[in-house]
């Protein structure tokens, strides 16, 4: 066990052009506070993943009012260290998030308003017991200067706070198998202390605070015999007595998650999903209120009305979960219509529309004939990514505004001559052909392929196409 300590030295405009505006004004005085979130390992964890190593919130800084016309100076800081206690071993490598929050002190309805000014994150290696490490991080136009260290709480010592030390019982030497505790040579390593309540018969530990079970026993304290009545979902070695596989203890057996947390197995261990108001590796840390800054990603915290709703996070768009810790896959709701491609930009959703569609959600069909006039008696036809007009005879073009040459397509077959006419075209057929397009040969016996020529027309006369 031990404590991670963070000392904020300054928060103000970074070097270079574009100095940020002061977050406070005479009309809206404000004060700063800081939140730190620690996670084990060097993995690139998302900002919304839980602070598995712990989190802490600073006190509020002095009230600050901007001097009119003055550039934003380094802002007045809260007193004291931010301290994040850790119960288990210090991991040596860790990720951190430090958030700078502004508390506005104007006459807001419902008390002070909070807003996130800057967030910095990083991954570091750090041995417990070492000196203060100094750091500078930039977030936009702001610069944060800070120092940090990890120190062990007695009786733990070592770079991971896993060795335990006790005062020597005898002045000359330590007990059998126990070494002196460097640098505290007057103390001796203590035997490992397993998790409180760990069964002395069926449990053992290799790290302090641990409780690992011998085969055939399970539960957080190794007090629950493994059932041999069922051979389903084997996990352990074969049992000679039952002839089937006895499940060895799984990480979630006996549910290590306290306070109603639900356990899920991970490749290396287990993960607890904690109910509102609890956090920590095993949901063992309780009594969280808004003062602890439990809302991630700029969520607004309001006090709940009972212990099971100790605080309520009102999440900004794009986040959900009781702590606003989960990023919403807003594209999973398929907001883009008509086959548009959804892009979640974090701060906003964007739809990339297919050809022929437009609008924030691709809801407007550009083929839509509404408001599209086809001239000269043409009719609008939807489709193909652009509206199309089916034009009346004698007209063409996209909107039927162009007068068409009906003879341009050479509609008269078999060498017939085409004449443009006010209501269409007329074909004058070559000898031996007849029909509106001169498409029918006249038979040598004088009968035509048509049953009869229309009254008043002799075969070979120009046929008017109506």
């Amino acid at each position: 066990a031990g404590v991670f300590e963070l000392q904020i030295h300054s928060f103000g405009p970074g070097p270079g052009p574009g100095a940020p505006r002061s977050p406070c004004s005479a009309r809206l005085p404000c004060r700063l506070f800081f939140r730190v979130c620690l996670k084990p390992g060097l993995s690139e964890e998302a900002a919304e993943s839980p602070c598995a190593l712990g989190a802490a919130l600073s006190a509020r800084g002095p009230v600050y009012t901007e001097q009119p016309g003055a550039p934003a100076p380094d802002l007045p800081l809260p007193d004291g260290l931010l301290q994040v206690p850790f119960r288990d071993a210090w991991p040596g490598t860790f990720s951190f998030i430090i958030e700078t929050w502004r508390e506005e002190l104007g006459d807001q309805i419902g008390g002070p308003a909070w807003s996130l000014l800057a967030r910095v994150a990083g991954r570091r290696r750090l041995a417990a017991g070492g000196p203060w490490a100094r750091d500078i991080q930039r977030a936009g136009a702001w610069e944060l200067r800070f120092s940090y260290r990890a120190r062990c709480e007695p009786p733990a010592v070592g770079t991971a706070c896993t060795r335990l030390c006790r005062p020597r019982s005898a002045p000359s030497r330590c007990g059998p198998g126990l070494r002196p505790c460097a640098p505290l040579e007057d103390e001796c390593e203590a035997p490992l202390v397993c998790r409180a309540g760990c069964s002395p018969e069926h449990g053992f530990c290799e790290q302090p605070g641990e409780c690992r079970c011998l085969e055939g026993w399970t539960g957080p304290l190794c007090t629950v015999p493994v059932s041999t009545s069922s051979c389903l979902s084997p996990r352990g070695p074969s049992s000679a007595t039952t002839g089937c596989l006895v499940p060895g203890p799984g990480p979630c057996d006996g549910n290590p998650c306290a306070n109603g947390g639900s356990c899920s197995e991970t490749p290396r261990s287990f993960e607890c999903t904690c109910p509102r108001g609890f956090y920590g590796l095993r949901c063992e840390v309780s009594g969280v209120t808004c003062a602890d800054g439990p809302c991630f990603n700029g969520g607004l915290c309001v006090g709940g009305a009972d212990p099971d709703s100790a605080y309520i996070c009102h999440c900004p768009p794009g986040f959900q979960g009781s702590n606003c810790e989960k990023r919403v896959d807003r594209c999973s709701l398929q907001p883009c219509r008509n086959g548009g491609l959804c892009l979640d930009l974090g701060h906003a959703l964007r739809c990339r529309c297919r050809a022929g569609f437009a609008g924030p959600r691709c809801e407007h069909d550009l083929d839509d004939c509404a408001g599209r006039a086809c001239a000269n008696g043409g009719t609008c036809v939807e489709g193909g990514g652009a509206h199309r007009c089916s034009c009346a005879l004698g007209f063409g073009g996209r909107d039927c505004r162009e007068r068409a040459d009906p003879c341009a397509a050479r509609p008269c077959a078999h060498g017939g001559r085409c004449y443009a006419h006010f209501s269409g075209l007329v074909c004058a057929c070559a000898p031996g052909y007849m029909g509106a397009r001169c498409e029918f040969p006249v038979h040598p016996d004088g009968a035509s392929a048509l049953p009869a020529a229309p009254p008043g027309l002799r075969p070979g006369d120009p046929q008017r196409y109506l």
């Epitope: 006090g303 009972d306 212990p307 709703s309």
Partner: antibody, heavy 117, light 109 residues
Framework: EVQLVETGGGLVQPKGSLKLSCAVS????????MNWVRQAPGKGLEWVAR??????????YYADSVKDRFTISRDDSQSMLYLQMNNLKIEDTAMYYC????????WGQGTLVTVSA | QAVVTQESALTTSPGETVTLTCRSS?????????ANWIQEKPDHLFTGLIG???NRAPGVPARFSGSLIGDKAALTITGAQTEDEAIYFC?????????FGGGTKLTVL
Amino acid sequence: EVQLVETGGGLVQPKGSLKLSCAVSAFTFTTYAMNWVRQAPGKGLEWVARIRNKSNNYHTYYADSVKDRFTISRDDSQSMLYLQMNNLKIEDTAMYYCVFYYDYVYWGQGTLVTVSA
Amino acid sequence: QAVVTQESALTTSPGETVTLTCRSSTGAVTTSNYANWIQEKPDHLFTGLIGGTNNRAPGVPARFSGSLIGDKAALTITGAQTEDEAIYFCGLWYSNHLVFGGGTKLTVL
């Protein structure tokens, strides 16, 4: 809008039993702890019982005055809250309210229980 | 068992500011008591005003505010109106048990 509708009140003799129900709508019932609160005629409010949600193992809590006589329960699938009252006493006469605490307090309209010989 | 104490009655005038308080027998009221304020009007009409010490319910006028003053929870009505005449109960949570105060009868003359 959150709605809590209590039913099941009535006239009962001392040592008798009664079961109150509360139908809940317009919020995710399964997520929250639920409570019964009562108000005797001309008196103040008295908290009676509380039942937590499934992730808190449906733990129940009771006021000393009703312990071992009243049982609070819930049916998450129906969004229903219940109060089984046994061995009723004259001092249990009151208006009974189904109450839900979240960001503030939500009340039902109440159901009257009268214990009289 | 904790006892929660409120003023039995208070009188104010329209437009005045009045503060109702809620004291715990176990010591200072803290945010961990999730102080709640409830208004009762005739015919058993209850309205939750404030939850979690200072969280005003939607639809409740801005003149109602909750806070901690010293070692007590407080409900302040800034600019009381005649329609604010009612009985006000405070409730405090002690772990999973809820204890109500006896109520304050507020008269707005």
